[in-house]
């Protein structure tokens, strides 16, 4: 069965997916669907990769780690009921039949607390794995650890750099990453 | 539940041969790729072979390259280590370990035991 | 091939302490990372993936993080259970390569 990721509605999900390139710089490509992994390919394709880039990726779905070291991880910004369900990640490694396929499961949970205002989203956007739980288990609550020191005139800034897949996996490690068990 | 089983695990002599199985259960074998790791007395962990989910593309680091094989059968759910041209360095427990998408050795079995020795 | 240099080999604490191990990937590599706990004469458990988040089931005094291309397991409150030795490998890179271990004891 499935292994089942949750978020809440309004923060960001995060499906992980890894796998190694055969060489450095060697890289495989990767497709994230929703649904689960047909026969071949991906179906209803939200992010793709080649053997050098992203090559196609559509609005609120993005790869926030280092894709060329086989990290393909998928985040989904803002998420909604709707994101619920199956997410499949193929790497579509050369050969017959070779290619390795995970169903991810999303669950969407209403969310506990009230909006943030408009800078406080901003600012929750700039790490993009928080609050992202993992497991069959009940949900649990936790606060967030120590933050880097950022303040409200460089999460604007961050905001607009947040494509930039190594300035996000930079924040991502420095301790606002909070996942449950 | 994801199962792995190793078997095969015998004492063999320097220059002996050894085939060491896994039965795999409890997920989608063909979809999956798959490894051996071994760990040896110090208890130092050591990748020893990886094979894609069809069972093209085999990877194996220097030490072992061109003395073991790692192939598989996926009709029968099983993984495989044909290992050749043995040394006393290659005893070691040796593990079968299936990726996921979290990494290269996301479940492992309980391993078996080869150990070589004249 | 990148080395994963494990520090300590082996540390013994009491109940109740804070407890770090780390990993240092050579060449000035940053790798995706995870780290494993192996009680005795079990085998190898995923413990952390991504250099910092927690497998299922498995207890949030464990946390991972990073800082360039060193890697930090913490316990926050040292219990009798967690006695194991722990491992890190990088998979980001052929060959695969795990840290040496470091073994943890209960004082």
């Known amino acids: 069965s499935e292994v089942e990721y949750r978020a809440e509605v309004g923060q960001n999900a995060y499906l992980p997916c890894f796998y190694t390139p055969a060489a450095p710089g060697n890289l495989v490509p990767v497709c994230w669907g929703k649904g689960a992994c047909p026969v071949f390919e991906c179906g209803n394709v939200v992010l793709r990769t080649d053997e050098r880039d992203v090559n196609y990726w559509t609005s609120r779905y993005w790869l926030n780690g280092d894709f060329r070291k086989g990290d393909v991880s998928l985040t989904i910004e803002n998420v909604t009921l709707a994101d619920s369900g199956i997410y499949c990640c193929r790497i579509q490694i050369p050969g017959i039949m070779n290619d390795e396929k995970f169903n991810l499961k999303l669950v969407i949970k209403p969310a506990k607390v009230t909006p943030a205002p408009t800078r406080q989203r901003d600012f929750t956007a700039a790490f993009p794995r928080m609050l992202t739980t993992r497991g069959h288990g009940p949900a649990e609550t936790q606060t967030l650890g120590s933050l880097p020191d950022i303040n409200l005139t460089q999460i604007s800034t961050l905001a607009n750099e947040l494509r930039d897949s190594r300035l996000a996996n930079d924040l991502r490690d420095s301790g606002a990453t909070i996942r449950i068990g | 539940e994801v199962q792995l089983v190793e078997s095969g695990g015998d004492l063999v002599k320097p220059g002996g041969s050894l085939k060491l199985s896994c039965a795999a259960s409890?997920?989608?074998?063909?979809?999956?790729?798959m490894s051996w790791v071994r760990q040896i007395p110090d208890k130092r962990l050591e990748w020893v072979a990886t094979?894609?989910?069809?069972?093209?593309?085999?990877y194996y680091p220097d030490s072992v390259k061109g003395r073991f094989t790692i192939s598989r059968d996926n009709a029968k759910n099983t993984l495989y280590l044909q290992m050749s041209s043995l040394k006393s360095e290659d005893t070691a427990m040796y593990y079968c370990?299936?990726?996921?998408?979290?990494?290269?050795?996301?479940?492992w079995g309980q391993g078996t035991l080869v150990t070589v020795s004249a | 091939d990148v080395q994963m240099i494990q520090s300590p080999s082996s540390l013994s604490a009491s109940l109740g302490d804070i407890v770090t191990m780390t990993c240092q990937a050579s060449?000035?590599?940053?790798?995706?990372l995870n780290w494993f706990q192996q009680k005795p004469g079990k085998s190898p458990k995923l413990l952390i993936h991504?250099?910092?988040i927690l497998e299922d089931g498995v207890p949030s005094r464990f946390s991972g993080s990073r800082y360039g291309t060193d890697f930090t397991l913490t316990i926050s409150s040292l219990e009798n259970e967690d006695m194991a030795t722990y491992f890190c490998?990088?998979?980001?890179?052929?060959?695969?390569?795990f840290g040496g271990g470091t073994k943890l004891e209960i004082k």
């Open positions: 991504g250099s910092n």
């Open positions: 409890g997920f989608t074998f063909s979809t999956n790729g």
């Open positions: 060449q000035g590599s940053s790798v995706n």
């Open positions: 490998l990088q998979h980001s890179y052929l060959p695969y390569t």
């Open positions: 094979i894609s989910s069809g069972g093209s593309n085999t």
């Open positions: 370990a299936r990726r996921s998408e979290l990494g290269p050795f996301a479940y």
